[in-house]
């Protein structure tokens, strides 16, 4: 779509006469019509196919036309057109004298033609106006002409619409050739698409407008490339949305679990050893001098009452030492030098030889402790109850009242651990944090009290005559219970039959 | 063959509020020529653009509607809805789910069948 | 508000005559037009778009043009399943905005 625009400049007609020679009276009152059509070699009759106009009067004989395009009036004449210009063209314009007002092609005689010009040619759309001049015998015609496209039609001819827009569907003006041009911050086909903010990512965020980065769900920061871990999430990230990869040291759904109390807590006190034993759990190995869970007490060696048979206990830099009452030596007291004879055994109770009369033990009555039973039982001055267990007299008995995961008779098990009664031997079984501990009996070792250490001075079987042998852990030598007619140490010896002796 | 269906229109109360869905067939919502629009039709009356949205989420609306009106997308599900809220009797209508082109410069060239809402107690 | 006024409200034609309705909008030649079609209890049918351009399947004898404040869609012989409303639309900003409609009606 466009418009053939003719621009009329000046007419001369100095003799005002008609193009029969004929002169006009009292001059040539001149209007033209103008006729636009397809190209033709030789500019014949027929259809205007391109349009037509037609001028009102314009002057008399010779005169310049004025340029009215400013006011609205019809210099330029207009010839739109609503279909793709072609590049090529003819016209026609003649000049015409009106005797009267009726310009109508019907009310004027055939003769009142002043001239008529024909061209044709090439034309291409633009704003240059192409100046051209005919001249005949009488009369001389100056104009000028182009072709220019309507309003929103761009392109060679004119066939390209192309309207500005600054809408969703849009942001774009048009360039001369049709195509569009996208307004700043706009990209697409069609420029309806933002660019969004540099470095906004492209899968994860998004925008409405330009320089606009909006996250889809799950991202978040500034240019969308932050996952969100999943809500709740305490020490740890996320490489996709809603992950929670827990951070060195935590663990659990959330990563709220300690896993390194040792580093995040720094539990164990005087310089002890931490190991992490499962979630907020951890184990102090304690230094020489220091005990407690996290090895926060300092121990005194004495608080173990090493000293046996009444020895008082004294703490030394280097450990303790025993002071033995009379009767007694070692380093804990525990060796006699008494023998029954000298009724060491007291509140009732009965001794008993070991060792051929070298030694002897008190058995005590009930109640009765010591190894002279010197020691009313107090059953819980021992602190029996192991694991924290409160401990409870009940008269001549004692009952442990034990903390929430421990049982047995003295708290010693750990309800988990030691339920299957792990340790040999009567070894006692403490739980711990992480695992469990065998206290052994003398005589026995090992992580389970599995292994024997001390000799078992029975076991080369020294006693004769069928007598019973009783081995004396504190000293590894055996005791021979002679059955009747047999005596000795080994009971080798039948009764009233001395032995003989080689000299 | 683009088919555009609607659902979840009926009689609603005074007051009350609507959510239409509009599912798409036969191509994919998250194409990037393509808004998702609502229009409505009130009973022998003529046509009102309530407002569209893009794949991305971005929404437009008419300005009278636009503080009662929510429309959202959902990619995965291939649809697309209309969230009316403090409905009114003049709000009864048929109301179209339709796609507009943004090749053919906005003009709507699939519409689903319609739904009737119809708001009265 | 941008208001598009078409016009006539209504219009009864002979079969093969010529239709010519007119939808008007401030400098509306500078937006793009687009016209549906309409049937009792039917949707919408896009006839015309991008002012003049007709989708595949619309018949030859709807045409459409738009200059200056006026659009207008043209139906040069009438035939009897023409018989519908028929709705301009344009986009103003970033609504859509139609006009009131055309009822066409077979004689």
């Known amino acids: 779509s466009g418009v053939f625009q003719l621009q009329l400049q000046e007419f001369i007609n100095e003799r005002g006469v008609l193009a029969s020679g004929r002169p006009c009276e009292p001059g040539c009152r001149t209007f033209f019509r103008v006729c636009l059509k397809h190209f033709q070699a030789v500019v014949s009759p027929g259809p205007c196919t391109f349009g037509t106009v037609s001028t009102p009067v314009l002057g008399t004989n010779s005169f310049a036309v004025r340029d009215d395009s400013s006011g609205g009036g019809r210099n330029p004449l207009q010839l739109p057109f609503n279909f793709t210009w072609p590049g090529t063209f003819s016209l026609i314009i003649e000049a015409w004298h009106a005797p009267g007002d009726d310009l109508r092609p019907e009310a004027l005689p055939p003769d009142a033609l002043i001239s008529k010009i024909a061209i044709q040619g090439s034309l291409a759309v633009g704003q240059n106006w192409l100046l051209d001049e005919q001249t005949s015998t009488l009369t001389r015609l100056r104009y000028s002409y182009r072709v220019i496209c309507s309003d929103n039609y761009y392109g060679d001819n004119c066939s390209r619409l192309c309207k500005k827009r600054n809408d969703h569907f849009g942001h774009y003006v048009c360039q001369p050739d049709g195509n569009l041009s996208c307004l700043p911050g706009w990209t697409g086909e069609y420029c309806q698409q933002p660019i969004c903010l540099s470095g906004c990512h492209e899968q994860n965020g998004y925008c409405s407008k330009p320089a606009e980065c909006l996250c889809r769900p799950g991202w978040q920061g500034r240019l969308c490339n932050e996952c969100i871990p999943h809500n709740g999430c305490r020490h740890g990230t996320c490489s996709t949305p809603w992950q929670c990869t827990c951070d060195e040291g935590w663990g659990g759904l959330f990563c709220d679990q300690d896993l390194n109390y040792c580093t995040h807590h720094s539990p164990c006190k005087n310089g002890a050893t931490c190991s992490n034993s499962g979630q907020r759990s951890y184990t102090c190995t304690c230094r020489p001098g220091y005990t407690g869970v996290d090895c926060e007490l300092e121990l005194s060696e004495c608080d173990s009452n090493p000293c046996r048979n009444g020895g008082s206990c004294k703490d030394q830099e280097d450990g303790y030492h025993c002071l033995c009452p009379p009767g007694y030596y070692g380093l804990h007291c525990e060796h006699s030098t008494l023998s029954c004879a000298d009724s060491p055994c007291f509140n009732g109770g009965s001794c008993r030889e070991r060792n051929q009369g070298a030694n002897y033990a008190c058995e005590c009555p009930p109640n009765f402790t010591g190894s002279n039973c010197e020691k009313k039982v107090d059953r819980c001055t021992s602190n029996p109850c192991a694991n924290g267990g409160q401990c409870l007299n009940r008269g001549p008995s004692r009952m442990c009242r034990c903390r929430p995961g421990f049982t047995g008779t003295y708290c010693e098990l750990h309800v988990s651990d030691c339920a299957r009664n792990p340790c040999a031997h009567g070894g006692t079984c403490h739980d711990l944090e992480n695992g469990l501990m065998c206290t052994c009996p003398a005589g026995f070792s090992g992580r389970r009290c599995e292994v024997r250490t001390s000799i078992d001075a029975c076991a080369s079987s020294p006693c004769f005559n069928r007598a019973t042998c009783y081995t004396d852990l504190s000293t590894d030598t055996f005791v021979c219970n002679c059955p009747y007619g047999f005596v000795g140490s080994r009971c080798e010896f039948p009764v009233g039959l001395p032995p003989s002796f080689p000299w | 063959e683009v088919q555009l269906v609607e659902s979840g229109g009926g009689l609603v109360q005074p007051g009350g509020s609507l959510r239409l869905s509009c599912a798409v067939s036969?191509?994919?919502?998250?194409?990037?020529?393509?808004?998702w629009g609502w229009i409505r039709q009130a009973p022998g009356k003529g046509l009102e653009w309530i407002g569209d949205?893009?794949?991305?989420?971005?929404?437009y609306y008419n300005p009278s509607l636009k503080s009662r009106v929510t429309i959202s997308v959902d990619t995965s599900k291939n649809s697309f809805y209309l969230q009316m809220n403090s409905l009114r009797a003049e709000d009864t209508a048929v109301y179209y789910c339709?796609?507009?082109?943004?090749?053919?410069?906005?003009?709507?060239?699939?519409w689903g069948q319609g739904t009737l809402v119809t708001v009265s107690s | 508000e941008y208001v598009l006024t078409q016009s006539p409200d209504f219009q009864s034609v002979t079969p093969k005559e010529k239709v010519t309705i007119t939808c008007s909008g401030q400098r509306l030649g500078d937006k793009y037009a687009s016209w549906y079609q309409q049937k009792p209890d039917q949707s919408p049918k896009l006839v015309i778009y991008e002012d003049s351009k007709r989708p595949s399947g619309v018949p030859s004898r709807f045409s459409g043009s738009n200059s200056g404040d006026d659009a207008t869609l043209t139906i040069n012989s009438l035939e009897a399943e023409d018989a519908a409303t028929y709705y301009c639309q344009a986009w103003d900003r970033d609504t859509g905005v139609f006009g009131q409609g055309t009822k066409v009606e077979i004689k």
């Open positions: 339709a796609r507009e082109d943004v090749i053919l410069r906005g003009g709507s060239d699939y």
């Open positions: 036969g191509g994919s919502i998250s194409s990037s020529s393509y808004y």
């Open positions: 949205i893009y794949y991305t989420g971005s929404t």
